[in-house]
């Protein structure tokens, strides 16, 4: 058993049929010594008495809010949550496996630049009685500070018969050095509580591996005289690290016909312009990637040819 926060405790349980559970000692937070009784949740049925109470915790019916009383007055509360371990593996019932980039990916994180700011998100089908708490650091043995905000519901989607809820959080490394080579990874830890079930999820990464630039901005077409060719130009996204001479991007320019089956013409360039043939009803799209490190491509920025 360990304390998650004041008066909230997590009991770690091996979860199998007829498991004996854990013996947990509750102590009433009071100077009183005598006449103390204990109840569980809203029940008026007395569980036991004494300043300390030893309880057997083996199922969710044993979790909940234990309250000690004296003469009708509430003295203190202890909320017990359960963390299940089945076959040596902690349960992951609350969050959905996003399966990208690999199985058992519950947290996904991205950074728009090297400033030390990043966003993580996760998915669940649970809509109520759900709380999240996020902590982060650079390294784990001698951790350096990363400050995370509160997790918020960022999207709702319908997937077949189910509703899916996306939560996200923004974090910022306290003393980020954008140009420095990373040697210790960022660690992100999410505590999830659904009703009386506790779970925790972790992710470990280097900022350089989660970089995904915003799409190029100000995408424009300039027809070339007496030609089917156009000059496409764009700019670095505002959110990208500066100076651009050091934090450089490479770009992919694509000409796509109206039909997805039509052949795509692609051009790769380090410049912020390219000359391409603009076919009727086609569109031109440009995306960006860090020039010196193969992290994710940005989403496409697009304009129609006409």
């Amino acid at each position: 058993i360990w304390e998650l926060k004041k008066d909230v405790y997590v009991v770690e349980l091996d979860w199998y049929p007829d498991a004996p559970g854990e013996m947990v000692v509750l102590t009433c937070d009071t100077p009183e010594e005598d006449g103390i009784t204990w109840t569980l949740d809203q029940s008026s049925e007395v569980l036991g008495s004494g300043k300390t109470l030893t309880i057997q915790v083996k199922e969710f019916g044993d979790a909940g809010q234990y309250t000690c009383h004296k003469g009708g007055e509430v003295l203190s509360h202890s909320l017990l949550l359960l963390h299940k371990k089945e076959d040596g593996i902690w349960s992951t019932d609350i969050l959905k496996d996003q399966k990208e980039p690999k199985n058992k990916t519950f947290l996904r994180c991205e950074a728009k630049n090297y400033s030390g700011r990043f966003t993580c998100w996760w998915l669940t089908t649970i809509s109520t009685d759900l709380t999240f708490s996020v902590k982060s650091s650079r390294g784990s043995s001698d951790p350096q500070g990363v400050t995370c905000g509160a997790a918020t519901l960022s999207a709702e989607r319908v997937r077949g018969d189910n509703k899916e809820y996306e939560y996200s959080v923004e974090c910022q490394e306290d003393s980020a050095c954008p140009a420095a080579e990373e040697s210790l990874p960022i660690e992100v830890m999410v505590d999830a509580v659904h009703k009386l079930k506790y779970e925790n999820y972790t992710s470990s990464f280097f900022i350089r591996d989660i970089i995904k630039p915003d799409p190029p901005k100000n995408l424009q077409l300039k027809p070339l005289k007496n030609s089917r060719q156009v000059e496409v130009s764009w700019e670095y996204p505002d959110t990208w690290s500066t100076p651009h001479s050091y934090f450089s991007l490479t770009f992919c320019v694509q000409v796509q016909g109206k039909s997805k089956r039509e052949k795509k013409d692609r051009v790769f360039t380090d410049k912020t312009s390219a000359t391409v043939i603009c076919r009727k009803n086609a569109s031109i799209s440009v995306r960006a990637q860090d020039r010196y490190y193969s992290s994710s491509w940005s989403e496409w920025a697009s304009v129609p040819c006409s």
């Epitope: 309880i55 083996k58 019916g61 044993d62």
Partner: nanobody, 114 residues
Framework: EVQLVESGGGLVQPGGSLRLSCAAS????????MYWIRQAPGKGLEWVST???????AYADFVKGRFTISRDNAKNTLYLQMNNLKPEDTALYYC????????RGQGTQVTVSS
């Protein structure tokens, strides 16, 4: 009519063991939390242990891992396994359907003495 009949008490040396039983009838035993309470000579009733309908237990501080409460719903029977008994465990032990002992049996005497 609710009936609770305790048995299994006796005289035992310090460090010894006893297993108390309580046969219940006249009510839906499996639907109730059940309790062991005791009364030492010249003292009031003292709560010992509780077992919930699920089989999960709670114990008084003085028990310190020495006693184990259990139930057999098929036999409508409550048990208290008492190990490493001490002289201060000497008391009349009751099984009860409520914490206050308002619905309890006649008790079984446990005496721990050398």
């Amino acid at each position: 009519e609710v009936q609770l009949v305790e048995s299994g008490g006796g005289l035992v040396q310090p460090g010894g063991s006893l297993r108390l039983s309580c046969a219940a009838s006249g009510f839906a035993f499996s639907n109730y939390w059940m309790y062991w309470i005791r009364q030492a000579p010249g003292k009031g009733l003292e709560w010992v242990s509780t077992i919930k309908t699920s089989g999960s237990a709670a114990y008084a501080d003085f028990v310190k891992g020495r006693f184990t409460i259990s139930r057999d719903n098929a036999k409508n029977t409550l048990y208290l396994q008492m190990n490493n008994l001490k002289p201060e465990d000497t008391a009349l032990y009751y099984c009860s359907r409520d914490y206050a002992g308002t619905v309890r049996g006649q008790g079984t005497q446990v005496t721990v003495s050398s």
